[in-house]
């Protein structure tokens, strides 16, 4: 009786279970009653990353330097090339097909998480007691100066964009 299901790493064809091709190899011909599945290695710069019955290998991704891309992991017969972005840039999508510059956090906002090759800068508003007076992709919100520790008093209140201004204490006669 012909099988209706096959074991792992096999596939059903012509009422017969044939072995799948291993990663890094493509299918040339299905097995028969008398012959094994015929597989062939993928060509250089091509890959297949699963046990398969594909007749064509996939092309390695190209990390195009003109798009700001660079290689993170070289492709092999079993794995695709993994791209990332050059310094100062990050991927526009999960598949990392192009790169854009990291955004800066505007005054009043600080960097919560510095950008990487695959993620943009994450900014956060400076809470009370903190400020940022620059547009930066690296600087966190900084705490207001503590006038008291310098034996000074607050002459001008701080904001999320400006530090407090300290001044001498008024001497009472």
């Amino acid at each position: 009786e012909p099988p209706t299901a096959c074991r792992e790493k096999q596939y059903l064809i012509n009422s017969q279970c044939c072995s799948l091709c291993q990663p890094g190899q493509k299918l040339v011909s299905d097995c028969t009653e008398f012959t094994e599945t015929e597989c062939l290695p993928c060509s250089e710069s091509e890959f297949l990353d699963t046990w398969n019955r594909e007749t064509r290998c996939h092309q390695h991704k190209y990390c195009d330097p003109n798009l700001g891309l660079q290689v993170q992991q070289k492709g092999t017969s079993e794995t695709d090339t993994i791209c990332t972005c050059e310094e100062g840039l990050h991927c526009t999508s999960e598949s990392c097909e192009s790169c854009v510059p990291h955004r800066s956090c505007l005054p009043g906002f600080g960097v919560k998480q510095i950008a990487t090759g695959v993620s943009d800068t994450i900014c956060e508003p400076c809470p009370v007691g903190f400020f940022s007076n620059v547009s930066s992709a690296f600087e966190k919100c900084r705490p207001w100066t503590s006038c008291e520790t310098k034996d000074l008093v607050v002459q001008q209140a701080g904001t999320n964009k400006t530090d407090v201004v300290c001044g001498p204490q008024d001497r009472q006669r």
């Epitope: 990663p23 290695p41 993928c42 250089e44 190209y62 070289k74 079993e78 695709d80």
Partner: antibody, heavy 119, light 113 residues
């Protein structure tokens, strides 16, 4: 028998140009990626450039980017390295080497051709 | 770029004795997809081009004597010659085959004591 034979090396002045060739035989050239690697006199190995089997993928070392161009002609079983704006620090023995689609390593190296950049 | 650091710079070993050299990479050479470490060793004899010795950290190239063995994973790798022969006098280079730019260690020169 796998053979890789380079030519085109020689003495050139700073700012000058040179084109290296690597003739391949004994294997199906169009099935292999190819690299150029150089070795300054008495020094270690430095990777220069790579081109995939079908010409689709090309990578360069930062030290040569914008000055060197790797190319190949599969019909002629030949690999090339066009070197422009040459500098004294480009003086080296230049090797072509092939990369197969299994190991993804440089499995055969040519004998090398010497490039000397000097005024 | 991945920096490859080899030690020692040179090694003098008696014939028939063991020679061991180290290679460290500044980041992991483990391919996450197939779990292979893409660390390659090349041998360069005086006046000759380099020759592929070992790939994937520990797989000997066809024709390479079994006295040569490679080991390690991630960032720490070792090449061992179990019983040094006169024809093993050479410089041995480890190479990052994991990512571009491909980078080489500075080499370990093996001599006979």
């Amino acid at each position: 028998e796998v053979q890789l034979v380079e030519s085109g090396g020689g003495l050139v002045k700073p700012g000058g140009s040179l084109r290296l060739s690597c003739a391949a035989s004994g294997f199906t050239f169009s099935d292999y990626g190819m690299h150029w690697v150089r070795q300054a006199p008495g020094k270690g190995l430095e990777w220069v450039a790579y081109i995939s089997s079908g010409n689709r993928i090309i990578y360069y070392a930062d030290t040569v980017k914008g000055r060197f161009t790797i190319s190949r002609d599969n019909a002629k079983n030949s690999l090339y390295l066009q070197m422009n704006s040459l500098r004294a620090e480009d003086t080296a023995l230049y090797y072509c080497a092939r990369q197969d689609g299994y190991r993804y390593a440089m499995d055969y190296w040519a004998q090398g051709t010497l490039v000397t950049v000097s005024s | 770029d991945i920096v490859m650091t080899q030690s020692p710079d040179s090694l003098a070993v008696s014939l028939g004795e063991r020679a061991t050299m180290s290679c460290k990479s500044s980041q992991s050479l483990l391919n996450s997809g197939n779990q292979k470490n893409y660390l390659t060793w090349h041998q360069q004899k005086p006046g000759q081009p380099p020759k592929l010795l070992i790939y994937w950290t520990s797989t000997r190239e066809s024709g390479v004597p079994d006295r040569f063995s490679g080991s390690g994973s991630g960032t720490d790798f070792t090449l061992t010659i179990s019983s040094l022969q006169a024809e093993d006098v050479a410089v041995y280079y480890c190479q990052n085959d994991y990512t571009y730019p491909l980078t080489f260690g500075g080499g370990t020169k093996v001599e006979i004591k």
